[in-house]
């Protein structure tokens, strides 16, 4: 999906209002320096591409993020503020339902969510205006 035509400011508002709090809840008890951030993004569409990938794509050691509250709210925000996003996700959603039976918080998942926090921070405040 090409995130170029999303309403970035509306997505930012959704993040600041709710998603950020859910990420904090997920990460509670984890030190901010515990993980090295290896994923970065260069502009807002790229940030959303990386956020989508880390949030919804299963990775080795972390297959359960898609059912978390922050993930569901992220999906809702993208569906509302990115034209045509919902249609591209129908097949992916079916695959996720088969792949994810339960929510398990692993160290790998905590690391992944730490990366997500950095990506969201970058998305919200790109230094060069990327509208």
């Amino acid at each position: 999906y090409d995130f170029t035509n999303c309403d970035f400011e509306k997505i930012k508002a959704a993040y600041l209002s709710t998603i950020s709090k859910d990420l904090i809840t997920y990460m509670s008890g984890t030190k901010s320096t515990e993980f090295n951030n290896t994923v970065s993004c260069s502009n807002r569409p790229h940030c959303l591409t990386e956020i989508q990938s880390l949030t919804f794509n299963p990775t080795a050691g972390c297959a359960s993020l898609a059912k978390e509250m922050f993930a569901m709210k992220t999906k809702a925000a993208l569906a509302i503020w990115c034209p045509g996003y919902s249609e591209t996700q129908i097949n992916a959603t079916q695959a996720m339902k088969k792949a994810r039976k339960s929510k398990v918080t692993t160290n790998k998942c905590l690391e992944q969510v730490s990366q997500l926090q950095g990506l969201w921070r970058r998305f919200n405040r790109p230094l060069l205006k990327q509208q």
Epitope: L16, T33, N37, Q117, R125, K129
Partner: antibody, heavy 120, light 111 residues
Framework: EVQLVQSGAEVKKPGSSVKVSCKAS????????MHWVKHAPGQGLEWIGA????????SYNQKFKDRATLTVDKSTSTAYMELSSLRSEDTAVYYC?????????????WGQGTTVTVSS | DIVLTQSPDSLAVSLGERATINCRAS??????????MHWYQQKPGQPPKLLIY???NLGSGVPDRFSGSGSGTDFTLTISSLQAEDVAVYYC?????????FGQGTKLEIK
Amino acid sequence: EVQLVQSGAEVKKPGSSVKVSCKASGFTFSTYNMHWVKHAPGQGLEWIGAIYPGNGETSYNQKFKDRATLTVDKSTSTAYMELSSLRSEDTAVYYCAREDDYGEGYFDVWGQGTTVTVSS
Amino acid sequence: DIVLTQSPDSLAVSLGERATINCRASESVDNSGLSFMHWYQQKPGQPPKLLIYRASNLGSGVPDRFSGSGSGTDFTLTISSLQAEDVAVYYCQQINTDPLTFGQGTKLEIK
């Protein structure tokens, strides 16, 4: 503990340059925008610019764009501000500051400040 | 650039009384229903300290006698019951539009 520690006070001659450092600890330096703010005697706060350590991208206040250069050294989690062609009105306390956790655009952690005095 | 104008420039209030500082922006600092206006307190020889973020949210560790309100172009910082340690200069700051700008500051003293 999250903190920013700046280099010590500097006395410089007009026309010279100064480079102020800001060492970060207690957080993932590469993912936070780092800002620089000027506070001249008897004046208000003035934003100089910001840098994103992840890729070195910068944003400057046009007033400082020609004379201020912001850089980072990710290996030591240190941000730098170099100010060239110094003049008397550059006499001020310079602060580095970390932008908040969420990208809201406020500064939640500040360095202790570095006093730069420009005098002949 | 968005110009932030604070009023008054200085203010003297009795201990225990209410102090109110205003900040007017030359254009709206709102975006998608959120107001990107922040308030800081600065005491002599110290760096600024965040008091209020996004117009009305209390910063970490800030006493609840401090509050913020407003939207669009007009914002207010209120100290409900002035304490001796509140003597400082107070600044508003916007980040909705680059470049980031501060108000000129309001000096708060004890009457």
